[in-house]
């Protein structure tokens, strides 16, 4: 449906409210160092413009596109090359070459300062003093940290956000009810950020059909009584919704999002019977509850996949009618089947079917040679099946922390040449796969784990991508989105790695480290063990392990001492030393 | 045209009730949300309360929170603004809007751009 004036359309679907935190979040994920009171003052200008459009949509530039007039707006700002230096050459560009130009600056890591919380009590006058203010810094401050947070689900965060300050700043203690929510708010935006990173990292290096293929899956393992022409719109739906908001087409994702939770709902008898509860929740709930919605029972009695995917004497001419329809009605077969199997299991079974049809449909006897088909997945069923259970013994067996060193060590060892601060993060989260799923029977630990695997390795590749270092990262980032994990674990120690030279200033320790909180010293501690494997990465588990548990008793001994600096000075010199003898250094 | 009528203005009693009627009638619109306003002789329109047709959900000012209660009837397009314990300062022209957003605001928070359509308003004289 065509609209006269783009903008006035979705400031009147949207409201002013949402326009403009919408606005301000897409300028904040386009122009990242840009401070707070530069965007709003863009925003405001933008958010009075839509008005004029609402008023008479033929007024002068209310036909442009969403993409020009947002973009001429940030190309007004008059520091823009020295604060971005080479972005600042997208502004001599036409739509949509500009766009796409910005795009490809969005930072992952931006050099800004970490953000620190202030105490409860100023937070609260803060958020009392100028409410709008204070959240509209939030959404600030995480999207240009994030720049490509799922935006509508980014209101629905701040939504939260206000409430847990409405209640908790009048609360007997504060503290005790706000710094819970917050934390709670904080991991589960980290991982929400990390979630959609993936999403645009799939549509954005491997296309709209991988990314369609792993809607597919995942939708069809979510919805298993629903018909494959349900999914494959709610697929095509999907696929929009996050092609525009991985896009920076924020406005158009939200609303879409917001018509395909209205369209899920008022469907859901033919989609799935665990929608009830989220159906009855307003807009933004509506939508996270359904995203998040556990998968519904499989129908009872589903025949087996051979009759109509090998033993057919038309699988041929069905694949060669329409190549991916037929893929997608397997892949969807396959999942609704298996919600105990990971989705990217279910794609690697998917492209080894696609594979062997290839072959087979050119062959003399098609059927003969594509008759064992099935039995090629039992290897790839196993592979995953047999790394979990390992990897949860040994994280049972160790606890979250020194199973979280064992893979810093693991990976170091892999890829040395990767900057210690991407190793450790990578590492810490790699690590968190175990208190996140171990727990669960066998049939979720699967899903559970390598799909937490595969956006937790994007990150490494993301991160590694804008300061590449490694071939070897960059050749299992790159040659395929489904065999990450796997190309990953199958990585050996690199032979070609030159040791680092020792620096006895790494290893150098201060009594500050003392009034750090315990996530914050395992931080430190975890630096100085990805230090120590690239300065000998030929060292042995039991050597490593011995240092540390001196690192560790040698800071614990220091932090009860009277006079901790002194401590830390004298007592560290002979760890290094001992240290270096140990591992022959 | 879409016409929008509000009624059930009066004088009334500080601490005393007010109900507000508002129809929606004439040609076929998309009303996702109705909401009334009010506006103070030389202050600006400000929000009071709004209803959502898609999941009947309720939004309310600070000011008014516990003491006005909005209801509707989707079918009819009415809606229905409970005035309680009413206070001098609620004293003002209430007007009914209708055509808002099909999004519900992230922050609670409606403005008068947000509707489409409007009553021509009812006088609301709380006395002391």
């Known amino acids: 449906d065509a609209h006269k004036s783009e903008v006035a359309h979705r400031f009147k679907d949207l409201g002013e409210e949402n326009f403009k935190a919408l606005v301000l979040i897409a300028f904040a994920q386009y122009l990242q160092q840009c401070p707070f009171e530069d965007h709003v003052k863009l925003v405001n200008e933008v958010t009075e413009f839509a008005k004029t459009c609402v008023a008479d949509e033929s007024a002068e530039n209310c036909d442009k596109s969403l993409h020009t007039l947002f973009g001429d707006k940030l190309c007004t700002v008059a520091t823009l090359r020295e604060t971005y230096g080479e972005m600042a050459d997208c502004c001599a560009k036409q739509e949509p070459e500009r766009n796409e130009c910005f795009l490809q600056h969005k930072d992952d890591n931006p050099n800004l300062p970490r953000l620190v919380r202030p105490e409860v009590d100023v937070m609260c006058t803060a958020f009392h003093d100028n409410e709008e203010t204070f959240l509209k810094k939030y959404l600030y401050e995480i999207a240009r940290r994030h720049p490509y947070f799922y935006a509508p689900e980014l209101l629905f965060f701040a939504k939260r956000y206000k409430a847990a300050f409405t209640e908790c700043c009048q609360a007997a203690d504060k503290a005790a009810c706000l710094l819970p929510k917050l934390d709670e708010l904080r991991d589960e935006g980290k991982a929400s950020s990390a979630k959609q990173r993936l999403k645009c990292a799939s549509l954005q290096k491997f296309g709209e059909r991988a990314f369609k293929a792993w809607a597919v899956a995942r939708l069809s393992q979510r919805f298993p009584k629903a018909e494959f022409a349900e999914v494959s719109k709610l697929v095509t739906d999907l696929t929009k919704v996050h092609t525009e908001c991985c896009h920076g087409d924020l406005l158009e994702c939200a609303d879409d999002r917001a018509d395909l939770a209205k369209y899920i709902c008022e469907n859901q008898d033919s989609i799935s019977s665990k929608l009830k509860e989220c159906c009855e929740k307003p807009l933004l709930e509506k939508s996270h509850c359904i995203a998040e919605v556990e998968n519904d029972e499989m129908p009872a009695d589903l025949p087996s996949l051979a009759a109509d995917f090998v033993e057919s004497k038309d699988v041929c001419k069905n694949y060669a009618e329409a190549k991916d329809v037929f893929l997608g009605m397997f892949l969807y077969e396959y999942a609704r089947r298996h919600p105990d199997y990971s989705v990217v299991l279910l794609l690697r079974l998917a492209k080894t079917y696609e594979t062997t049809l290839e072959k087979c449909c050119a062959a003399a006897d098609p059927h003969e040679c594509y008759a064992k088909v099935f039995d090629e997945f039992k290897p790839l069923v196993e592979e995953p099946q047999n790394l979990i259970k390992q990897n949860c013994e040994l994280f049972e067996q160790l606890g979250e922390y020194k199973f979280q060193n064992a893979l810093l060590v693991r990976y170091t060892k892999k890829v040395p040449q990767v900057s210690t601060p991407t190793l450790v993060e990578v590492s810490r989260n790699l690590g968190k796969v175990g208190s996140k799923c171990c727990k669960h029977p066998e049939a979720k630990r699967m899903p559970c784990a390598e799909d937490y695997l595969s956006v937790v390795l994007n990150q490494l590749c993301v991160l590694h991508e804008k300061t590449p270092v490694s071939d070897r990262v960059t050749k299992c980032c790159t040659e395929s989105l489904v065999n990450r994990r796997p190309c990953f674990s199958a990585l050996e120690v690199d032979e070609t790695y030159v040791p680092k030279e020792f620096n006895a200033e790494t290893f150098t320790f201060h009594a500050d480290i003392c009034t750090l909180s315990e996530k914050e010293r395992q931080i430190k501690k975890q630096t100085a063990l990805v230090e120590l494997v690239k300065h000998k990465p030929k060292a042995t588990k039991e050597q490593l392990k011995a240092v540390m548990d001196d690192f560790a008793a040698f800071v614990e001994k220091c932090c009860k001492a009277d006079d901790k600096e002194t401590c830390f000075a004298e007592e560290g010199k002979k760890l290094v030393a001992a240290s270096q003898a140990a591992l022959g250094l | 045209e879409l016409q929008v009528v509000e009624s059930g203005g009066g004088l009334v009693q500080a601490g005393g009730s007010l109900r507000l009627s508002c129809a929606a009638s004439?040609?076929?619109?998309?009303?996702?949300?109705m909401g009334w306003f009010r506006q103070a002789p030389g202050k600006e329109r400000e929000f009071v309360a709004a209803?959502?047709?898609?999941?009947?959900?309720?939004y309310y000012a600070d000011s008014v929170k516990g003491r006005f209660a909005i209801s509707g009837d989707n079918a009819k397009n009415t809606v229905y603004l409970q005035m309680n314990s009413l206070k001098p300062e609620d004293t003002a022209v209430y007007y009914c809007?209708?055509?808002?957003?099909?999004?519900?605001?992230?922050?609670?928070?409606?403005?008068?751009?947000?509707?489409?359509?409007w009553g021509q308003g009812t006088q609301v004289t709380v006395s002391s």
């Open positions: 809007a209708a055509e808002g957003p099909k999004w519900e605001p992230w922050n609670g928070i409606y403005h008068p751009a947000d509707f489409g359509s």
């Open positions: 209803i959502t047709w898609s999941g009947g959900t309720t």
């Open positions: 004439g040609r076929t619109f998309r009303s996702n949300t």
